[in-house]
């Protein structure tokens, strides 16, 4: 077959507008949030979804932008500043830090285009790197050398 | 910022190819590696990345598929089966499991398309949902009801 | 100027182990991937794995049986291959490699260290 | 894995001749193939990526083409600088493989 790059197909055969449609379904974490009796509140539970489970739990926050692909991103927030005992599942223990994992995630914006003498052309998509917080991880501090 | 190559414009102006290119650049999580003396072992580190200070230690591995954008995706390797004590930092404490934190991302696979007739027209993408694992997170097992 | 320079050579007896590092310079170390490859005396290349610096994510040959582990100091700018459990036929040049890649098409090792001489006996 | 095989193992050609090798894979590779060239007592270097994509800085004497399992790596016009041993790699999947090489002399 041709040569790859020419993704989608013959000339005159714009799909990228599929494409878009493609990648705005929201794809938030894969196991389904559970109701959580207290559900912003600094404790690991011993049921329910793994960020309610987790001794550095969090809470997921939507971040949804119409004209970003795709549109609806998840942030985890921390709910508690230090790691929660794996004993009680409730007091803090001073000794770990809930820190957040960062991912810089590739996503696409839809500005107006401009064509010949700065008439609109449709819409491009420029190319972003965007911060996501992923999850909250129970670490030991820092200790600085 | 100059143009990002019109993507979903006027019909006729197939530039697919271009976002097939933009698209490529690995991007892992944020915070670059630091040596890890035992960069296989079930402990937390006191400093480097996230993944080797947390109590719930992993590693990444690399997954390139060159039909795929993205081509590299990382996913998390747990390397313990248990948390590590925040006092220590080596034993594991059996009160807690390191549990995957698994994410359906939406990836794009290169497929030949096919024109009227059945003829070759080139390449299109296809749609997928693709598991991957962030991350290990220290959580308490779940008590069965 | 993009430069990879590889430590010396070793000599080890069957059964232990070695590391060899590889000092890159000219170029942003955690932009690239980082490839070794073997090459016993009269054979082919070999590639051994490959190493991401960003994150430390690794891809290995299973073909080593999991004798191999790639490491990376960013703060020096240096990648590591160890390699256990030595035997007779691992003897041979060690390479560290850069991989450049152009958002989909290709993956190509465009510099290479001098070369590490590993001799077990 | 993907085996990798070259043909020939050695060749010996005079200066202005076209010297052509061929490589071939066990299983279709698209165009995810590079070549190689090793002179005697030095390191690997990269002339070909992408099956046809001169790397910066290999003379024009040097072309690739193929697709799939078949591929070529040409020299237009045998200069002496050119005596090296020549290899493909295919990076379509991990592990990463090459040919066994072919030795290219002067007669």
């Known amino acids: 077959y041709s040569h790859w790059p020419s993704c989608c197909p013959s000339k005159g055969q714009d799909t990228s507008e599929e494409l878009l449609r493609w990648s705005t379904v929201p794809v938030p974490p894969l196991e389904p949030a559970r109701p959580n009796r207290h559900p912003e509140s600094c404790r690991a539970s011993e049921d329910g979804p793994l960020n309610s489970r987790a001794i550095s739990p969090w809470r997921y926050e939507l971040d949804r932008d119409l004209n970003r692909l795709p549109q609806d991103l998840y942030h985890a927030r921390c709910l508690c500043p230090h790691c929660v005992s794996l004993q009680t599942g409730s007091h803090m223990d001073p000794r770990g830090n809930s820190e957040l994992l960062y991912h810089n995630q590739t996503v696409f914006y839809r500005r107006p285009c401009h064509g010949e003498k700065g008439t609109h052309k449709g819409y491009c998509l420029e190319r972003r790197l965007y911060r996501v917080s992923l999850a909250c991880v129970c670490v030991r501090p820092r200790v600085m050398g | 910022y100059s143009h990002w190559p019109s993507c979903c414009p006027s019909k006729g102006q197939d530039t697919s190819e271009e976002l097939l290119r933009w698209s490529t650049v690995p991007v892992p999580p944020l915070e670059p590696a630091r040596p890890n003396r035992h960069p296989e072992s079930c402990r937390a580190s006191e400093d480097g990345p996230l993944n080797s200070r947390a109590i719930s230690p992993w590693r990444y591995e690399l997954d390139r598929d060159l039909n795929r954008l993205p081509q590299d995706l990382y996913h998390a390797r747990c390397l313990c089966p248990h948390c590590v004590s925040l006092q220590t930092g080596s034993h594991m404490d059996p009160r807690g499991n390191s549990e995957l934190l698994y994410h359906n991302q939406t990836v794009f696979y290169r497929r030949p398309c096919h024109g009227e007739k059945g003829t070759h027209k080139g390449y299109c993408l296809e749609r997928r949902l693709y598991r991957v694992s962030l991350a290990c997170v220290c959580v308490r097992p779940r008590v069965m009801g | 100027e993009v430069q990879l320079v590889e430590s010396g050579a070793e000599v080890k007896k069957p059964g232990a182990s070695v590391k060899v590092s590889c000092k890159a310079s000219g170029y942003s170390f955690s932009g690239y991937t980082m490839n070794w490859v073997r090459q016993a005396p009269g054979q082919r290349l070999e590639w051994m794995g490959l190493i991401n610096p960003y994150n430390g994510g690794t891809s290995y040959n299973q073909n080593f049986k999991g004798r191999v582990t790639l490491t990376v100091d960013t703060s020096a700018s240096t990648a590591y291959l160890e390699l256990n459990s030595l035997r007779s036929e691992d003897t041979g040049v060690y390479y560290c490699?850069?991989?450049?890649?152009?958002?989909?098409?290709?993956?190509?090792?465009?510099?290479w260290g001098q070369g590490t001489l590993v001799t077990v006996s | 894995d993907i085996q990798m095989t070259q043909s020939p193992s050695s060749l010996s050609a005079s200066v202005g001749d076209r010297v052509t090798i061929t490589c071939s894979a066990s299983?279709?590779?698209?165009?995810?193939l590079n070549w190689y060239q090793q002179k005697p007592g030095k390191v690997p270097k990269l002339l070909i990526y992408?099956?046809?994509s001169l790397h910066s800085g290999v003379p024009s004497r040097f072309s690739g083409s193929g697709s799939g399992t078949d591929f070529t790596l040409t020299i237009s016009s045998l200069q002496p600088e050119d005596v090296a041993t020549y290899y493909c790699?295919?990076?379509?999947?991990?592990?990463?493989?090459f040919g066994q090489g072919t030795k290219l002399e002067i007669k």
């Open positions: 299983q279709g590779i698209h165009w995810n």
């Open positions: 790699q295919q990076f379509n999947s991990f592990p990463y493989t």
């Open positions: 490699a850069r991989e450049d890649f152009d958002s989909w098409t290709y993956f190509a090792m465009d510099y």
């Open positions: 992408y099956t046809s």
